[in-house]
């Protein structure tokens, strides 16, 4: 009896992992095997595929081949008993495209309030991504074990953080990879579950904010409670995308280690130009807070966009608020050459409810006032450019009266 | 292969000082941190500090502040441990340890034994 | 300093048994807690990072748990080779610690 070649051929290509699936044609002929050859572009001998030679099931494995996987290729397979069948020719594939991402590792990391996710591809030294293995971007799905209510969290790189969750609470994920550049997204991780830790008796330093004085940089921060050290630490951000050995060696400032206010000030440059991420930790000497949640601080942004410095002409019912550019060290004006967006808050200086305007012209007014009442006012600039989503520190508070009624004209 | 070579044990005189080195192969030490730790006989670990071989930043714990200084030659991919003013509190076995991030401590060397007689 | 108490110095197993090592931190370091082995004469050698993850060849016998203040490490169906000093050590802020150790013996 004649043996009927085989048909249906997958190739499944998952990283590294190559492997080939068919049907049978002929359920009823037992102690069949079957061999596959391989043809590379502009060849025309073929070539017997290690790995998938005489196999009795319907699935064989071929990574052990080592192949260009840019470069295309052709497969064909065939029934052996006593006889063969004839040559079953596959669609020529080329690996790359044909490639699927495996599910990356994940390793977590749990604190009261935030789960530390460092994330590597699932083949370590990939042939398939060598060229790729810088592009990897990641998205995940988180959820609270208990309420199944997914975020999704996209565009993350081999490090992240995930802040604002709740203590002692079991909270659920999983990752996929992507690499954007081939239009490839990979497949989910196994679910990895943590369970974060019981609160913390120091909470982390809040509200981080880096402003510039003259040469030099000051940070301010907020904390809870008085009599406190605090240290402050930077990275450049280049190494959050970098997919290395998870090691990030956070270097200590100078100037801000052992500090005992909620600022500090260091030279301008302590810092090349680059951007980098600034952390801050608490501590009162027995016990030490985890760390605050890392800002991200652009040199060249940070030293062009000062806090604007303005004028108050007061009226009986508004304000009138000119805004000229900021000052640098030697009372000089500093030209931002990117267009600016101004928030003015006010407020009445007896009261804490504050009001808010947004304003792209240089001459404000603030309308709606009661006479002879002190007024505060504050500022800051905005980029309007949304790849530069920037924004200064706010200017110093500056308070006014206005004038008795009937001043308006 | 990942490996720590300490160099060979050491006998030396109270008062003197002494410099041991932790070779790394298998791995560039700038992309780690080399930490040191100590044991007594028959006692528990007690950790003495750790450089950044890359830029020599180091740590150290306050006990061991002015006694121990941690240096790297990244050229050679050596590690150094120099302990100075030894007194018979310092006969101990030094372990020095590759700290890959979260994987901790993930390789030590084989320790060296320091002994402190007149 | 973060004191890391292992509050058994000794503890007396069989083969086959299960046993706990715990520690305790005095203060929360999140999951930043390893354990080692050290056997007699050899220099220790790493179990059990993040406070649950093994390193590669350690056998899964060796279980990891807890986080916060509270670690344990639970060997189950003991045998003879785990007769060790068993350390927990802390990552997580300078100093770094170590718990002053636990020796498995086997009856």
């Known amino acids: 009896k004649n043996l009927k070649s085989p048909q249906k051929v997958e190739v499944d290509i998952i990283d590294d992992n190559f492997i080939l699936r068919w049907n049978r044609s002929d359920e009823s002929v037992g102690n069949v095997t079957f061999s596959f050859d391989y043809q590379k572009t502009g060849m025309d001998n073929w070539i017997k595929l290690s790995g998938c030679q005489n196999i009795t099931s319907t699935k064989c494995n071929f990574s052990s081949l080592k192949l260009n996987v840019y470069e295309e290729i052709k497969l064909r397979i065939r029934a052996e008993k006593e006889n063969t069948s004839s040559w079953y020719e596959v669609d020529s594939f080329t690996p790359f495209r044909k490639a699927q991402i495996g599910p990356p590792e994940v390793h977590l990391e749990a604190e009261d309030k935030a789960i530390v996710i460092h994330i590597s591809p699932g083949t370590k030294d990939s042939v398939m991504w060598a060229l790729d293995g810088l592009s990897f971007t990641y998205s995940l799905v988180i959820w609270k074990n208990s309420s199944g209510v997914e975020e999704r969290i996209e565009n993350i790189y081999s490090r992240h953080k995930i802040y604002k969750l709740s203590p002692e609470t079991t909270y659920c994920l999983k990752v996929k990879a992507a690499l954007l550049t081939s239009w490839k997204i990979g497949v989910y991780s196994p679910v990895h579950c943590i369970k974060t830790t019981v609160e913390n008796e120091l909470p982390p330093p809040e509200n981080i904010e880096v402003s510039v004085q003259n040469q030099n940089y000051v940070l301010k921060w907020d904390y809870t409670y008085a009599n406190m050290t605090f240290q402050v630490q930077w990275l450049h951000a280049f190494l959050k995308r970098n997919p290395g050995n998870h090691l990030y060696k956070w270097k200590q400032i100078p100037d801000c280690e052992n500090v005992k206010t909620t600022q500090c000030v260091f030279p301008q440059n302590v810092f090349q130009k680059g951007i980098y991420l600034l952390r801050v930790q608490a501590s009162d000497g027995n016990n030490t807070s985890f760390w605050s949640e890392e800002i991200k601080f652009d040199t060249e942004i940070q030293a062009f966009l000062l806090p604007p410095v303005f004028n108050i002409r007061s009226l009986s019912d508004s304000f009138h608020i000119y805004i000229g550019a900021p000052k640098q060290s030697g009372n000089t004006p500093v030209i931002q050459d990117y267009p600016l967006i101004y928030e003015i808050i006010f407020w009445e200086n007896t009261s804490n409810a504050e009001r808010k305007i947004i304003e792209k012209k240089t001459d404000v007014t603030v309308p709606n006032l009661k006479p002879l009442t002190v007024y505060c006012v504050k500022a800051r600039a905005h980029t309007m450019d949304e790849k530069l989503n920037k924004s200064s520190v706010f200017s110093d508070a500056v308070c006014e009266k206005t004038k008795p009624g009937n001043t308006s004209k | 292969e990942v490996q720590l070579q300490q160099s060979g044990a050491e006998l030396v005189k109270p008062g003197a000082s002494v410099k041991l080195s932790c070779t790394g192969s298998?791995?560039?030490?700038?992309?780690?941190?080399i930490h040191w730790v100590k044991q007594r006989t028959e006692q528990g670990l007690e950790w003495i500090g750790r450089i950044d071989p890359e830029d020599g930043e180091t740590k150290y714990a306050p006990k061991f502040q002015g006694k121990a200084t941690i240096t790297a030659d990244t050229s050679s991919n050596t590690a150094y441990l120099q302990l100075s003013s030894l007194t018979s509190e310092d006969t101990v076995v030094y372990y020095c340890?590759?700290?890959?991030?979260?994987?901790?401590?993930?390789?030590w060397g084989q320790g060296t034994s320091v002994t402190v007689s007149s | 300093d973060i004191v890391m108490t292992q509050s058994q110095k000794f503890m007396s197993t069989s083969v086959g048994d299960r046993v706990s090592v715990t520690c305790k931190t005095s203060?929360?370091?999140?999951?930043?807690v390893a354990w080692y082995q050290q056997k007699p004469g050899q220099s220790p050698k790493p179990l059990i990072y993040?406070?649950?993850y093994r390193y590669s060849g350690v056998p899964d016998r060796f279980t990891g748990s807890g986080s916060g203040t509270d670690f344990t490490l639970i060997i189950s169906n003991v045998q003879s080779e785990d007769l060790a000093e068993y350390f927990c050590?802390?990552?997580?802020?300078?100093?770094?610690?170590f718990g002053g150790g636990t020796l498995l013996e086997i009856k």
């Open positions: 203060q929360n370091v999140g999951t930043n």
């Open positions: 050590h802390q990552y997580f802020s300078y100093p770094y610690t």
């Open positions: 340890g590759r700290y890959h991030g979260y994987w901790a401590l993930d390789y």
């Open positions: 993040s406070t649950s």
């Open positions: 298998g791995f560039n030490i700038k992309d780690y941190y």
